[in-house]
Interface confidence: medium
């Protein structure tokens, strides 16, 4: 596929990413997919820097991540290392709650009010961040 | 047992502040959400206000925003609401009521409430 | 914000009937949905929450069921301790917002 060397119309450049930031809340799952139709995937934080710059995007609201544990170990969506890279949890998190009465544990990851992550019930309609690399191959056909 | 009881209430003239709190015993009062929701004479329950386990995040309704202000001194075991500027309309019974986890996962335990009547 | 609507707002019934009370989200709120029980001039009690889980302590005679936008409570044999006017509440999103209560009154 072609290589893409600019961001999409409304997504937001950095560190040669390209960020797109939701105005409006779904579930982790339909957040995910979300950003895989746009060639791109939930937002993978691996460094202090990158999560103070979405950190000041999103603001003071529950925002989903691409980070989950719903087959077990702790994975980011793009196969980023977890245990190895960057963490900025909440105190006590992640902690897995089965108390909430809501059926199964909390298997995703979110930036919570203070750009911390907690990890939550994976229906809430959260909103979401996507990113996708520049200089990488994009999935499309190369025009002929 | 778990038991959460209010006190501050009381009657006090428009614009005027008043300061309630909520005394929390029998549970771990650091790990739990803490809410305040009050009641106008004869009328439904409205949710006014929420704070995380630890204090770092607050919620409130639009009718209070900006004029209450919620906090916590989990040393204390202690749930506060700091009432400014008060109108008729925020006469009521408050109650405190904790969260069944951090913070977002609704109401489970109530205290009997106090009453602040906004009056002059 | 989401709106919650309670139907009947009152009902009147007799020891031993069965009660149906609804409430209605203006948007979907999967199962994030809590009853309360308030008797006159006391706080409220929590029955249910997650739309059908028991709270602690709560006889078996409360029941609640529902998903997404509709949600029911049912007293299954309504006794004299039951007459109390009835709330539900969301929890999917801030601001929580409570139904406008079912007041259950003796026929």
């Known amino acids: 596929g072609s290589e893409r060397t600019c961001c999409p119309v409304n997504w937001v450049e950095h560190e040669r990413s390209c960020y797109w930031f939701s105005r409006s809340g779904k579930a982790w799952a339909d957040a995910d997919n979300y950003c895989r139709l746009e060639d791109a995937h939930l937002v993978v934080v691996t460094s202090w820097e990158e999560q103070k710059f979405v950190q000041r995007h999103i603001g003071p609201v529950n925002t989903w991540m691409g980070l989950h544990d719903q087959n077990g170990p702790w994975k980011w969506v793009d196969g980023t290392d977890y245990e190895t890279g960057f963490k900025n949890w909440r105190p006590e998190q992640p902690d897995d709650w089965y108390g909430h009465g809501l059926g199964g544990g909390e298997d995703c990851a979110h930036f919570t009010d203070d750009g911390r992550w907690n990890d939550d019930v994976c229906q809430r309609p959260y909103r979401w961040v996507c990113e996708t690399e520049l200089d990488k191959a994009s999935q499309e056909p190369p025009l002929l | 047992q778990v038991q959460l009881v209010e006190s501050g209430g009381g009657v006090v003239q428009p614009g005027r502040s008043l300061r309630l709190s909520c005394a929390a015993s029998g549970f771990t009062f650091s790990s739990y959400g803490m809410h305040w929701v009050r009641q106008a004479p004869g009328k439904g329950l409205e949710w006014v206000a929420v704070?995380?386990?630890?204090?770092?995040?607050?919620h409130y309704a639009d009718s209070v925003k900006g004029r209450f202000t919620i906090s916590r001194d989990n040393s204390k075991n202690t749930l506060y609401l700091q009432m400014n500027s008060l109108r008729a309309e925020d006469t009521a019974v408050y109650y405190c009521?904790?969260?069944?986890?951090?913070?977002?996962?609704?109401?489970?335990?109530w205290g009997q409430g106090t009453t602040v009547t906004v009056s002059s | 914000d989401i709106q919650m609507t309670q139907s009947p707002s009152s009902l009147s019934a007799s020891v031993g009937d069965r009660v149906t009370i609804t409430c209605r989200a203006s948007?979907?709120?999967?199962?994030?949905l809590a009853w309360f029980q308030q008797k006159p001039g006391k706080a409220p009690k929590s029955l249910i929450y997650a739309a059908s889980s028991l709270q602690s302590g709560v006889p078996s005679k409360f029941s609640g069921s529902g998903s997404g936008t509709d949600f029911t409570l049912t007293i299954s044999s309504l006794q004299p301790e039951d007459f109390a006017t009835y709330y539900c509440?969301?929890?999917?999103?801030?601001?929580?917002?409570f139904g406008g209560g079912t007041k259950v009154e003796i026929k």
């Open positions: 948007q979907g709120i999967s199962n994030y």
């Open positions: 009521a904790r969260d069944r986890g951090v913070g977002y996962y609704g109401l489970d335990v």
């Open positions: 509440q969301h929890y999917l999103t801030y601001p929580l917002t």
């Open positions: 704070i995380w386990y630890d204090g770092s995040n607050e």
